[in-house]
């Protein structure tokens, strides 16, 4: 009779195993091993007895021991079962970004792993097991399908396989896929509200603001704000679902015409997208042409507004005849004239709105002096040791150098306030003098004397 | 009958080197393993070294690696233990011995002495 | 490396007398222990095997137990022929070691 020990055995594969091959009989023929492993001997003393070693065992594998013995020959078989934990355990890839109330499909992937009988797949979210499968097939594939929520985001799934050898006195053999991070998201399906100015012009710079609310997670959007390929890099503030970003525009001459304004906002893997069209449009002041700014009483002046080709002027509220960006108009100058105003306005139609710009000059004319009788009485009578304050103003432009001499010598003092006496009385020759020429009038001051009783 | 007979040993001096022979019979050295076991006088038993016939895989104790080289020849049904740069401390008889991981059948020992 | 001791080192024994040699392990070596008896000038002698393992000519006196890292051999009864230094070894890794040894001798 041939018996084996052990008559079973677990061992992790490319392991090796002592199998010892007994007989009853105690001069057997033949005492050996059967088995396609390689094996050594490991002697001892006596014939009934051989332990081998078999190694590299890398499947189930039935060596059997044989005898033979005066009453015949007779075999026994040992069972080696191999155990080994998968080689690979993977979920399917998956986009990192999944929507809200999108059904998702984990798929888990086990190739490799022995015996299967006792190898089992387990599909987790976090540490909650979501789903639990023998391993069936090479690979083994395990799928199970998830409504996406909002509590899912930042969530790991993964997969485990359980090699449970505890029943046959091992361990409980554990290998866990990468895990797969959810990220969830809600983007609405109304685009983002862009407010910016219609029209911009040319060397300024004007507000764009993008927003939108309903986002989840707000704070991972990325909100890509452009005018035509200038990147406008926006100032966001978040709200518990919304977002505004705020950016300045600044545009140029080589911007001008019709430009695309964009504001796109990208969450997960969608995006949506709002276009709008800004007109940048260059439109200087109009310019007031005066022949010269400053002109002697008399001179013919001309004054010219000229403005953009598209634009309409109007030049001291009169409209151009025809309507158009040119007007002028002509004048003899007078001293009444002096520091007139001349005002251009122009208005210019840019994608609907009308624009106005406006620009002044003022005439300078030069005249006199002026003295007259108005101004500058020709006679005055004061009662003696009366306050008194002599007046006389010279008119002009420049403004006249006023002298008032009395023999050539004695100043009457004009707009001081004096104490009349006999000195003061008699003929002044007052002079009026400036670049324009000068002009003189005699002014008397009568002096009353107080009559004594 | 399984037999296992050492030879080689002898007096060397220190830094010098020997070869211990083990002729084995009643079985064939490329079926089992073959080791080499010393005993200083009146000390312990020490493993040395150990060989696969069938594929020349050596494992050697750390106080005789880079030292000595065990071998086999299957043809001769011989084992062999080189010893280089011998030590004082090396003086043992060595046993040549088979089997895996117990030691079956010994040889009678042969004595080395390293002295000067 | 696995150390391996033995006690006593040595003891004093009657010829019939039960005697218990103890070898402890430093570190769990499961079953992979081994005893031999040795006699000045002689070759060790395989006893037990695995611990436990009978040897085929050995007399039954000899008996083996323990797992992990404490182990015993028993004789059942000491017979004169029994004096001797007996040893433990380790196969459980490299490098295999032995225990010093426990003489037992004649009181």
């Known amino acids: 009779q041939t018996s084996v020990s052990p008559s079973k055995v677990i061992l992790p594969r490319g392991g090796s195993v002592l199998v010892t091959c007994s007989t009853s009989c105690d001069q057997p023929k033949l005492l050996g091993i059967e088995t396609p492993l390689p094996k050594k001997e490991l002697l001892l003393p006596g014939n009934n007895r051989k332990v081998y070693e078999l190694s590299n065992v890398q499947e189930d594998s039935q060596p059997m021991c044989y005898s033979n013995c005066p009453d015949g020959q007779s075999t026994a078989k040992t069972f080696l079962t191999v155990y080994w934990t998968p080689e690979r355990v993977e979920l399917a890839p998956l986009p990192s970004w999944q929507p809200v109330g999108k059904n998702l499909t984990l798929r888990c992937q086990v190739e490799g792993g022995a015996p299967r009988a006792n190898l089992t797949v387990v599909l987790l979210r976090g540490e909650k097991e979501l789903k639990r499968e023998p391993a069936v097939g090479e690979p083994a594939e395990v799928t199970t399908t998830v409504l996406v929520r909002r509590d899912h985001h930042g969530a790991n799934f993964s997969c485990r396989t359980e090699l449970d050898l505890r029943p046959q006195g091992l361990e409980l053999f554990e290998n866990t896929s990468a895990p797969y991070q959810l990220q969830t998201f809600v983007l609405p399906a109304t685009p983002p509200q862009l407010v910016s100015p219609r029209v911009l012009e040319v060397d300024t710079q004007g507000t764009v603001v993008c927003s939108l609310d309903g986002l989840f997670p707000v704070s991972e959007a990325q909100v890509h704000l452009a005018l035509g390929d200038q990147r406008l890099n926006p100032t966001v503030t978040y709200g518990n679902d919304s977002f505004s970003a705020k950016a300045s525009v600044s545009v140029t001459a080589e911007d001008e015409g019709t430009q695309r304004l964009t504001c796109a906002v990208i969450l997960g893997n969608q995006s949506q997208e709002t276009l709008q069209t800004v007109t940048i449009y260059s439109f200087p002041a109009p310019n007031v042409i005066l022949t010269k700014p400053e002109v002697s009483e008399g001179t013919e002046v001309t004054v010219k507004c000229e403005a953009h080709p598209r634009a309409k002027v109007t030049l001291n509220g009169v409209p151009a005849q025809p309507l158009g960006p040119r007007a002028q108009l002509l004048l003899k100058a007078t001293p009444e004239d002096n520091g007139r105003s001349f005002s251009c306005s122009a208005t210019l139609e840019v994608a609907g709105q009308l624009i106005h710009k406006n620009q002044t000059r003022e005439l300078r004319v030069l005249y006199g002096p002026r003295l007259d009788e108005r101004d500058c009485p020709g006679n005055w009578t004061w009662p003696e040791n009366s306050q008194q304050t002599p007046m006389c103003q010279a008119w002009g432009n420049p403004l006249p150098e006023l002298k008032c001499l009395k023999d050539g010598t004695f100043p009457l003092p004009i707009g001081e306030s004096v104490t009349v006496t006999r000195d003061l009385e008699g003929t002044y020759l007052c002079r009026a003098r400036s670049t324009q020429g000068e002009v003189t009038r005699k002014v008397t001051v009568n002096v009353l004397s107080p009559r004594y009783e | 009958e399984v037999q296992l007979v050492e030879s080689g040993g002898g007096l060397v001096q220190p830094g010098g080197s020997l070869r211990l022979s083990c002729a084995a019979s009643g079985f064939n050295i490329k079926d089992t393993y073959i080791h080499w076991v010393r005993q200083a006088p009146g000390k312990g038993l020490e493993w040395v070294a150990r060989i696969d016939p069938a594929n020349d895989n050596t494992i050697y104790a750390d106080s005789v690696k880079g030292r000595f080289t065990i071998s086999a020849d299957d043809s001769k049904n011989t084992a062999y233990l080189q010893m280089n740069s011998l030590r004082a401390e090396d003086t043992a008889v060595y046993y040549c011995?088979?089997?895996?991981?117990?030691?079956?059948?010994w040889g009678q020992g042969t004595l080395v002495t390293v002295s000067s | 490396d696995i150390q391996m001791t033995q006690s006593p080192s040595s003891l004093s024994a009657s010829v019939g007398d039960r005697v218990t040699i103890t070898c402890r392990a430093s570190q769990s070596i499961s079953n992979n222990l081994h005893w031999y008896q040795q006699k000045p000038g002689k070759a060790p002698k395989l006893l037990i095997y695995?611990?436990?393992q009978s040897i085929s000519g050995v007399p039954s006196r000899f008996s083996g137990s323990g797992s992990g890292t404490d182990f015993t051999l028993t004789i059942s009864s000491l017979q004169p022929e029994d004096f001797a230094t007996y040893y433990c070894q380790q196969s459980n890794s490299w490098p295999y070691t032995f225990g010093q040894g426990t003489k037992v001798e004649i009181k």
């Open positions: 011995t088979t089997s895996g991981y117990w030691f079956a059948y």
């Open positions: 695995h611990a436990s």
